[in-house]
């Protein structure tokens, strides 16, 4: 799996989308998990409704929400009030029994708020991530 980079601004919301084959993953619940390092285990953050037919209902864990368009085949995760500690590797997963298939690997990058002048001399202009030359970046 290639890694898709999603960049958000500190304090704002970031929406992450994970497209998938709706037929292949028919009847499967989905989950969003946080990976501890590039090779680390993935810790579940939030999953879709226990009843697959109700997957369109938004489920929340703290500042993270998940909703699934099972017909269109798009899982959407929203991270509200993005903070520096939200940065890192995540995965969108499709669940079946005790197994989980990776739908997408995601790197969330948190950019400093350009309107926050506390660090005006240290404004960070995001560039390409050195570790992911071929990564796809979405804003």
């Amino acid at each position: 799996h290639n890694t898709t980079v999603f960049q958000g601004v500190e304090g704002q919301s970031l929406q992450v989308s994970c497209p998938y084959d709706s037929m292949k993953h028919w009847g499967r619940r989905k989950a969003w998990c946080r990976q501890l390092g590039e090779k680390g285990p993935c810790q579940r953050v939030v999953s879709t409704h226990n009843l697959w037919l109700l997957s369109f209902l938004r489920r929340r864990n703290g500042s993270t929400a998940i909703t699934d368009d099972t017909l269109g085949g798009t899982l959407t995760i929203t991270l509200r009030n993005l903070q520096p500690h939200d940065a890192g590797f995540y995965q969108c997963q499709s669940l079946h029994g005790s197994e989980a298939d990776t739908l997408r690997k995601v790197l969330v990058e948190v950019l400093a708020d350009p309107l926050d002048h506390r660090d005006a001399g240290d404004l960070w202009v995001p560039g390409e991530s050195e570790s992911f030359e071929d990564a796809h970046v979405e804003h």
Epitope: Q35, L36, G37, E38, K39, G40, P84, H85, A87, G88, F89, L107, E109, V110, A112, D122, W124, S129, E130, S131
Partner: antibody
Framework: QVQLVQSGAEVKKPGASVKVSCKAS????????IHWVRQAPGQGLEWMGW????????KYAPKFQGRATITADTSTSTAYMELSSLRSEDTAVYYC?????????????WGQGTLVTVSS | DIQMTQSPSSLSASVGDRVTITCHAS??????LSWYQQKPGKAPKLLIY???NLHTGVPSRFSGSGSGTDFTLTISSLQPEDFATYYC?????????FGQGTKVEIK
């Protein structure tokens, strides 16, 4: 018991090469990145490079590019660091270090260190 | 390469003191900073990862904070076993780089 065990101390002449080994026990090196870090006497820590044993991909600090070679043998769960064209300033303790990579690894294992002395 | 600058380079303190070590990165590194403790003749030991997360088994008197370019390691009440050298390391990009170290000595 999870540990990294390194090969013994080496004394080398300037211009020679040295190969230090690092054997993992209690875990599989494919699940980790193996880094090499060195420390000259009385000095700080210096990152040399890493290998992803699963992919065979390695990356080096610019200072060591072309002179250091990091390899891994997954069948024996051993990583190696070879440094060529040795000079006196390469005298240092060389550590191997396993983690899950950048972006928040919670795993962190270190070898006991291998002293490499370069002297004519 | 990202340069990591620690201050002070050494400090003298007494048991029970509150000790603060700072680390400045030459570029924005988000929260990708680790703190290590090293004692003479021993390998480094991870104390803090991701700027503020305490590694397993590390006493709660150690804490880390910061994001972006400025980071702090605090020892709330220095214990005899805490006299050592402390290093910060960035994990945002390769090559990984360490600060030059801060030696904490007995006053």
């Amino acid at each position: 018991q999870v540990q990294l065990v390194q090969s013994g101390a080496e004394v080398k002449k300037p211009g020679a090469s040295v190969k230090v080994s690092c054997k993992a026990s209690g875990f599989s090196i494919e699940d980790f990145y193996i880094h090499w870090v060195r420390q000259a006497p009385g000095q700080g820590l210096e990152w040399m490079g890493w290998i992803d044993p699963e992919q065979g991909e390695s990356k080096y600090a610019p200072k060591f590019q072309g002179r250091a070679t990091i390899t891994a043998d997954t069948s024996t769960s051993t990583a190696y660091m070879e440094l060529s064209s040795l000079r006196s300033e390469d005298t240092a303790v060389y550590y191997c270090h396993a983690d899950h990579g950048n972006y928040g690894s919670t795993m962190d294992y270190w070898g006991q260190g291998t002293l490499v002395t370069v002297s004519s | 390469d990202i340069q990591m600058t620690q201050s002070p380079s050494s400090l003298s303190a007494s048991v029970g003191d509150r000790v603060t070590i700072t680390c400045h990165a030459s570029q924005h590194i988000n929260v990708w900073l680790s703190w290590y403790q090293q004692k003479p003749g021993k390998a480094p030991k991870l104390l803090i990862y991701k700027a503020s997360n305490l590694h397993t088994g590390v006493p709660s008197r150690f804490s880390g904070s910061g994001s972006g370019t400025d980071f702090t390691l605090t020892i709330s009440s220095l214990q005899p076993e805490d006299f050592a050298t402390y290093y910060c390391q960035q994990g945002q990009t390769y090559p990984r780089t360490f600060g030059q170290g801060t030696k904490v000595e007995i006053k």
